[in-house]
C-alpha cells in the first residue's frame, strides 16, 4: 500500500494506491483511492506513467479529458465515473500488454488540496492449473496443465503422504509457446503415483503462484485449485 500526501500542510490530501499485476490479454485494474470531495466538478484525476510523455488518463469537470492521452493508451482506459465522487480514482485498463508494466502515478486535485501516490504495475500471464490422472500412461501418472504463463514459471510437485519429498526425478515439465508467441502452456507429468494420497502441482513466477491439488482414492478423485498474486501491496 502506498499512501501519498500533497505538499504544504492543509492543502494536502491522502491518496492511496495498491501495487498490482496485470494478466496480459485481459483487463487490469490500477487501484487508487482518495479523500472524496462533495462536488464532482472540483475533482481532477490524472494517471501518469514513468517514461511516457503523454497522459495515461485524465478525468476532470465530471468527464474524461483525453486530448493529451499517450498513443499507447488510446481506447484502452476508463475510470469508474460513477465512483469518483466517493473517492475511487481506479483505472480500468483494456487488453493488458507486457509493455504496460512500470511505475504509475495517481495524481488527484480536489477543493481540499492535492495529493499523489505511485503504483508498481507488473505484467505477465498466469492461469489456474488442472491436475488429472493420465489414463494413457503405462503406470499411474498425473498430468498438470496450465494454459498461460509468462515469464516462465517453476513447477514443483508435493504430496501429503511424502511431505518434503523431492519429486524432480519422477516428474517431467515442458513449456509450449502459445500462438501469440509470448505466453506459454505449462505441462508437468508426475510418475509412480500412489493411491490414497493428495498431490499438489505448484506453479510460480515472480507475479503469481498457483496450485492444483488432486486427491486420488480407490473410489473417487477430488480436485481443487487456487491462484494467488504475489505482489499486491499498498502505498
Amino acid at each position: 500500500l502506498i499512501i501519498g500526501f500533497g505538499i504544504s500542510g492543509r492543502h494536502s490530501i491522502t491518496v492511496t494506491t495498491v501495487a498490482s499485476a496485470g494478466n496480459i490479454g485481459e483487463d487490469g485494474i490500477l487501484s487508487c483511492t482518495f479523500e472524496p470531495d462533495i462536488k464532482l466538478s472540483d475533482i481532477v484525476i490524472q494517471w501518469l506513467k514513468e517514461g511516457v510523455l503523454g497522459l495515461v488518463h485524465e478525468f476532470k469537470e465530471g468527464k474524461d479529458e483525453l486530448s493529451e492521452q499517450d498513443e499507447m493508451f488510446r481506447g484502452r482506459t476508463a475510470v469508474f465515473a460513477d465512483q469518483v465522487i466517493v473517492g475511487n480514482a481506479s483505472l480500468r485498463l483494456k487488453n493488458v500488454q507486457l509493455t504496460d508494466a512500470g511505475t504509475y502515478k495517481c495524481y488527484i486535485i480536489t477543493s481540499k488540496g492535492k495529493g499523489n501516490a505511485n503504483l508498481e504495475y507488473k505484467t505477465g500471464a498466469f492461469s489456474m492449473p488442472e491436475v488429472n490422472v493420465d489414463y494413457n500412461a503405462s503406470s499411474e501418472t498425473l498430468r498438470c496443465e496450465a494454459p498461460r504463463w509468462f515469464p516462465q514459471p517453476t513447477v514443483v510437485w508435493a504430496s501429503q503422504v511424502d511431505q518434503g519429498a523431492n519429486f524432480s526425478e519422477v516428474s517431467n515439465t515442458s513449456f509450449e509457446l502459445n500462438s501469440e508467441n509470448v505466453t506459454m502452456k505449462v505441462v508437468s507429468v508426475l510418475y509412480n503415483v500412489t493411491i490414497n494420497n493428495t498431490y499438489s502441482c505448484m506453479i510460480e513466477n515472480d507475479i503469481a503462484k498457483a496450485t492444483g491439488d488432486i486427491k486420488v482414492t480407490e473410489s473417487e478423485i477430488k480436485r481443487r485449485s487456487h491462484l494467488q498474486l504475489l505482489n499486491s501491496k499498498a502505498s
Epitope: G25, H57, L66, S67, E68, R74, G75, R76, R92, N95
Partner: antibody
Amino acid sequence: QVQLVESGGGVVQPGRSLRLSCAVSGFTFSSYGVQWVRQAPGKGLEWLGVIWSSGSTDYNAAFLSRLTISKDNSKNTVYFQMNSLRAEDTAVYYCARDVTTIVEGFAHWGQGTLVTVSS
Amino acid sequence: DIQMTQSPSSLSASVGDRVTITCKASEKVGTYVSWYQQKPGKAPKLLIYGASNRYTGVPSRFSGSGSGTDFTLTISSLQPEDFATYYCGQTYSYPFTFGQGTKLEIK
C-alpha cells in the same frame, strides 16, 4: 443531445478520391473517439478506422494505404478521405461515437452518407 | 483479424417468442462484444455493449451474455418493432470486426 451528421457522399469516378465530413455536437472531442464504418448495399458492417481525442488514428490494415482520418477541433468536425476508389467501395459510410472511453461499442451513429463509385 | 460468426443468418419467429442469436469469435475477445439492431435504410442502433450491458433506453427484453469467444443476444418476448437485422461486433483488437448479421423475420 449527441448528434453526428455525415456529408459529402455522392457519385465518384473510379480512381478518384472521396472526402466525407462528420459534424458532431452534444459531446466534446476531448472525451471520445470517432469511428468510421461502412456498409455495402445488402451487406454487413465493416470497420474502417478511428480518430482519437488526441488526434492520433488507427486504421483497418486493409485500407491503410489509401485512408486518412483527420479532425478540426474548432469546427467539431471529423474528415474522412479515401483515395483510389473502386466499384467495391460503393457503400453507405457512417461515423459513430464510442459508448465508453474504453470502446465497448458504438453508441451514437450518423444517418450515413451513400457513396457510389461509378464511371 | 478476429472473425465474428453469427448464427443463424436468418430466422422466422412470431410476436411473443423468445429468440436467441449467437456470435462466436475466432479468438478470445474478453467482454468486448456489442450488439446492434438495424432496420432498412437506417443506421445501426446499439443494444448491448460490453457483452451484457444494456444501452440507455433499450427495452429490458433485450439481454446479452457471454465472455471469451461465445456470446448471446436474447429477446425474451418479441415485439412487432423487433423485426430487423442484428449484428454483433468486437472492439477488443484491431481491426474491429462485425458478424455477418442475423435477419429476424415475421413467421
